[in-house]
Interface confidence: medium
């Protein structure tokens, strides 16, 4: 579990604007506001680490801080799924793990966290400024996604601690279950705001550590907020993208699964071609121009079925049936 504070750190107001009493009444509303907004909501954290031994090797760790059961985890790079991101691995608690190059090893660390080791060379290797995103689908919370990248000044072998992601998206309504104490705090917050509404507001310095102020563009809106806010996702160095996507399939047009859910994704097929061209359900590439099919290469690596997905202090957990891990 994470030990960092859940509330963003606020810089003190500039000297002379308000006294100590004013500072207390200034910070308290923000703390209460943050608690009111985040109470009862799940959170996703992402940690990206470059291995000291191999500069082209990355380890991505993601975790879900929520009470629901995780039904699926999707790890992508180059932005969130549906916003230009490419899926690296899909982890299903029952069906196992499927991973795609340059992912080398994806695994469950606990029932609510995963890790993914990436390696590669040349065009398929990740770069230091590549953004990695993790999306957790859980019940009943819904889908939650967060993104992270390697801190710009980090040395190989080091990484920032797992940073709590801002709350990016909730697919289900009614998940903000505010407790009675927090409800009281919210009421008190409104009371304070009303008291201070005619008082000149002190200026705050932008926080250097708040998750809301992305460090090296570490966080990005989910596909839902991207669509709503039209926020350009400008972090990606295109030279770091997999060569197979950029060079091998130059005709990949609009996706038919337009924005990628946890378990769906891009289609190299424009809407105009739906009626005339059959769309491959798995493992094939469609050229929009000529409708011909070319095999997209080998299937993801197949690992044997004897994988224990969740470490259990009481010993290996029995799984019903083979996992069919790829």
């Amino acid at each position: 579990m994470r030990t960092e504070a859940q509330v963003p750190a606020l810089q003190p107001p500039e000297p002379g604007l308000e006294g100590a009493m004013g500072h207390r009444t200034l910070v308290l509303p923000w703390v209460l506001l943050t608690l009111c907004v985040t109470a009862g909501t799940p959170e996703v954290w992402v940690q990206v680490r470059m291995e000291a031994t191999e500069l082209s090797s990355f380890t991505i760790r993601c975790g879900f801080l929520g009470s629901g059961s995780i039904s699926l985890v999707t790890v992508s790079w180059g932005g969130p799924n549906g916003a230009g991101g490419t899926t690296l691995a899909v982890l299903h608690p029952e069906r196992g793990i499927r991973q795609w190059a340059p992912a080398r090893q994806a695994r469950w660390e606990t029932q609510s966290s995963i890790s993914l080791i990436l390696e590669g060379s040349g065009a398929s290797s990740p770069c230091a400024n590549t953004t990695f995103c993790c999306k957790f689908a859980s019940f009943p919370e819904g889908s939650w996604e967060a993104c992270g990248s390697l801190p710009p000044s980090s040395d190989p072998g080091l990484s920032a601690p797992p940073t709590p992601a801002p709350i990016l998206r909730a697919d289900l309504a009614g998940i903000l279950g505010v407790s009675g104490v927090l409800l009281f705090g919210c009421v008190y917050l409104l009371h304070l705001l009303r008291r201070h509404k005619h008082r000149p507001a002190p200026r705050l310095q932008p926080s250097r550590t708040s998750p809301q102020a992305p460090r090296a563009r570490a966080w990005a809106p989910s596909q839902a907020s991207q669509a709503a806010l039209h926020v350009p996702y400008a972090t990606i160095n295109t030279s770091c993208r997999p060569a197979t996507l950029d060079t091998a399939h130059p005709h990949g047009g609009p996706s038919w699964w337009a924005s990628l859910p946890t378990h769906a994704a891009h289609r190299p097929q424009g809407p105009a071609a739906w009626a005339s061209t059959p769309i491959p359900a798995r493992g094939s590439f469609v050229s929009v121009e000529n409708g011909l099919y070319a095999q997209a290469g080998e299937r993801p690596p197949h690992t044997g079925p004897g994988l224990t997905l969740f470490p259990d202090p009481r010993g290996p957990r029995a799984m019903e049936g083979p996992l069919g891990v790829r």
């Epitope: 039904s71 699926l72 999707t74 490419t86 899926t87 899909v90 299903h92 069906r95 499927r98 795609w100 689908a137 859980s138 019940f139 009943p140 919370e141 819904g142 889908s143 697919d171 289900l172 197979t244 996507l245 091998a248 399939h249 990949g252 996706s255 038919w256 699964w257 337009a258 924005s259 990628l260 859910p261 946890t262 378990h263 769906a264 994704a265 891009h266 289609r267 190299p268 059959p278 769309i279 491959p280 359900a281 798995r282 493992g283 094939s284 590439f285 997209a296 299937r299 083979p322 069919g324």
Partner: antibody, heavy 127, light 107 residues
Amino acid sequence: EVQLVETGGGLIQPGRSLRLSCAASGFTFSSYAMHWVRQAPGKGLEWVAVISYDGSNKYYADSVKGRFTISRDNSKNTLYLQMNSLRAEDTAVYYCARDVMVYCSSTSCYFYGMDVWGQGTTVTVSS
Amino acid sequence: DIQMTQSPSSLSASVGDRVTVTCQASQDIRDYLNWYQKKPGKAPKLLIYDASNLEAGVPSRFSGSGSGTDFTFTISGLQPEDVATYYCQQFENLPITFGQGTRLEIK
């Protein structure tokens, strides 16, 4: 408990319209692609349509293309099938089904199979 | 469209028997094939996914094998509750297509 419940079936005249609903519960509906599959009397299963998790993209069997429309309302956890210009050959039990997991890269799409099905609703098209 | 041909269309066997159903695809579908069980008045049930993987909660007497165009579904020890129609389904290409079904009865 994960559950899908179809409603809206009935006896309808050829050329008329009907809308089927599928209410989902017990899982994060908005994270799953959903299918409609039908079974005509004495016949086998026939896939009808699929819709992406957010409703933005759909694909249909040739036999229903242009007449049927699949849609969803994630806020209501409900899948729909709007059936227009109904024909006698559309008579069937209609099932909604959840795709256990769909992953698509820009070159491939991975359907994992329909792991949760509703009990079905019967549509009879007859004059 | 990819055609799926199942055989036999129906079969009768005794409790405890080993029952085998085959499914042939009109083109290579690698192992992108599922097997479903359908009982009258009930919803279909996923038994085998990716040609050979047993769905969680499904008895181990059910198994599947094959790759490419030829697939086999086996019930190693037939039970009375296995009376149903069994369908193969390919998901290599859209549209997703099913075999015509194999109706299984108890002698």
